[in-house]
């Protein structure tokens, strides 16, 4: 290899000394670029690690309440491919929880400008029975909330099979599943492929024709015979779920104000809520039309904010 290098240099020298100098300069430049490249790669790796950590921080688990769906219309598919899947998407916005501590209250006004005015005045003297109480109005510091689209595709060609017994070798079980699900007497049909996972005892079966999956799914179970023993495997629709347009939002509520400074009050929360309501209804107190008041004098309460 060294001899090769010498040969190359010799050829270059024969051409012209200038060309050789240029080549040496180029070599220096290439070395510099290589070093910079390595440096950038390290930087990318560092940033990717940071990104992964940041992603973990923003992972959330939300209990989304059940929603009643309204069926609007039937669409006539333009082609067969539209029949092979049923698609639907849902817009999900999480409610942002806020814990009202003891001695605090939340007041929501009808108009944003009233809330802003109450906050800018900061100190307010509220008459609670025979006590003139000084409360402080602040913006509500909300945690971040999320908004995303759930895109669901229900296949009309595939089914999920679970509770498959671990009684056969993998290839034999794959064949057995294909054979069983191709039997027309059981509602089956020609199988295109079987993706079997022995560890989880589950499989995804893809049929050649549309309609076979529907027929099988009319029942929750399907008979799978192995050495004269009937095992009842569970069949369910094959769905693919994608999260789209995932957004994290944070901010302060424009119409709701946090009131603090009521720690010493020993009264019924509802009475205090009424008195706060009356006080802040009045324009001379910097208030306006009130939507709702929630007060916490004993146990902390959770209030939920939504867009």
């Amino acid at each position: 290899m060294e001899a090769d290098k010498d040969d190359t240099q010799q050829i270059l020298k024969e051409h012209s000394p200038d060309e050789f100098i240029k080549d040496e300069q180029n070599k220096g430049l290439i070395d510099e670029i290589t070093k910079k490249n390595i440096q950038l790669k390290k930087e990318i790796q560092k940033l990717e690690t940071e990104l992964q950590e940041a992603t973990k921080e923003f992972q959330i688990k939300e209990d989304i309440p059940e929603t009643k769906m309204k069926f609007l219309s039937v669409e006539t598919p333009e082609n067969d491919s539209q029949l092979s899947n049923i698609s639907c998407s849902f817009q999900v916005s999480s409610k942002v929880p806020y814990e009202i501590q003891k001695g605090q209250a939340l007041i929501t006004f009808e108009k944003e400008e009233v809330a802003q005015n109450v906050v800018s005045m900061s100190k307010h003297h509220v008459q609670i029975k025979d006590v003139n109480l000084e409360v402080t109005a602040k913006p509500v510091p909300l945690n971040s909330g999320v908004r995303f689209q759930v895109y669901v595709e229900v296949s009309k060609m595939k089914i999920n099979v679970t509770e498959i017994p671990d009684t056969l070798r993998e290839d034999q079980m794959r064949d057995k599943l294909e054979l069983s699900f191709s039997k027309s007497r059981n509602g089956g049909g020609e199988v295109d492929r079987v993706d079997y996972d022995r560890q989880s005892g589950s499989a995804v079966i893809t049929f050649v024709e549309i309609g076979v999956a529907d027929k099988i799914l009319k029942k929750k179970e399907y008979p799978l015979y192995i050495n004269q023993t009937c095992h009842r495997v569970t069949v369910s629709p094959y769905t693919e779920i994608h999260l789209k347009k995932y957004q994290i939002f944070s901010g302060t509520s424009k119409r709701t104000v946090l009131l603090t400074g009521m720690e010493g009050i020993q009264m019924d929360e509802e009475i205090v809520e009424d008195l706060i309501n009356i006080h802040f209804q009045r324009a001379k107190n910097g208030g306006g039309e009130v939507d709702v008041v929630k007060c916490s004098l004993g146990q902390p309460h959770i209030a939920y904010f939504e867009e």
């Epitope: 070798r169 064949d175 054979l179 191709s182 199988v191 192995i226 050495n227």
Partner: antibody, heavy 124, light 112 residues
Framework: QSLEESGGDLVKPGASLTLTCTAS?????????MCWVRQAPGKGLEWIAC????????TYYASWAKGRFTISKTSSTTVTLQMTSLTAADTATYFC?????????????????WGPGTLVTVSS | ALVMTQTPSSVSAAVGGTVTINCQAS??????LAWYQQKPGQPPKLLIY???NLESGVPSRFKGSGSGTEYTLTISDLECDDAATYYC??????????????FGGGTEVVVK
């Protein structure tokens, strides 16, 4: 419905040979295994190998046939058996047979369709 | 490995008589047993599958029975045409081994 074997020949020890089985009147489906069975002159039937006719194309061999014999599905109506390092002991009539699933559950099987056989003679 | 042991290797009986052929599997084959008839120069012909189910077109004189590891083929009202070699065969699926097929050694039936 019928099966026909071809490729049988007189070969020298150590040679290789490929047999072909062609199906007529039906094409392979999930309800079948396509198999090869041989019979030495004046002897009994000996199972060699099977291939699942469904999508997986899983293959199964008799322990003595592993490594030297290869079964393949070359189309929806043909199956081949490749044989290597042949010896005089491999001299036999080679049958192609369809192993059929008889019940709704794939638990009862039977070779319900056979080819007439093709003769393989290994001799120097 | 699955081994099928067939007895006797040869049996003879008169026309109208009955013959019984036995087949023993080396392990439980769950009644997945078939019986075949083979005549010289011909491929085997399936008679019975699932130990006792008659293949279509096969006379009811052929009767299969058994379970577990022990199986029997009974041919009654013997006819000259029944002279042939009979084989038992099974295919076994299991958790610990490949799917396996095996034939018995065969029983030659001679009709006098």
């Amino acid at each position: 419905q019928s099966l026909e074997e071809s490729g049988g020949d007189l070969v020298k020890p150590g040679a290789s040979l490929t047999l072909t089985c062609t199906a007529s009147g039906f094409s392979f489906s999930s309800s079948y295994y396509m198999c090869w069975v041989r019979q030495a002159p004046g002897k009994g039937l000996e199972w060699i190998a099977c291939i699942y006719a469904g999508s997986s194309g899983s293959t199964y061999y008799a322990s003595w046939a592993k490594g030297r014999f290869t079964i393949s599905k070359t189309s929806s109506t043909t199956v081949t058996l490749q044989m290597t390092s042949l010896t005089a002991a491999d001299t036999a009539t080679y049958f192609c047979a369809r192993e059929y699933s008889y019940d709704d559950y794939g638990d009862f099987w039977g070779f319900n369709l056979w080819g007439p056989g093709t003769l393989v003679t290994v001799s120097s | 490995a699955l081994v099928m042991t067939q007895t006797p290797s040869s049996v003879s009986a008169a026309v109208g008589g009955t013959v019984t052929i036995n087949c023993q599997a080396s392990q439980n084959i769950y009644t997945n047993l078939a019986w075949y008839q083979q005549k010289p120069g011909q491929p085997p012909k399936l008679l019975i599958y699932g130990a006792s189910n008659l293949e279509s077109g096969v006379p009811s004189r052929f009767k299969g029975s058994g379970s577990g590891t022990e199986y029997t083929l009974t041919i009654s009202d013997l006819e000259c045409d029944d002279a042939a070699t009979y084989y038992c065969q099974s295919s076994l699926e299991s958790r610990i081994a490949d799917r396996a097929n095996a034939f018995g050694g065969g029983t030659e039936v001679v009709v006098k």
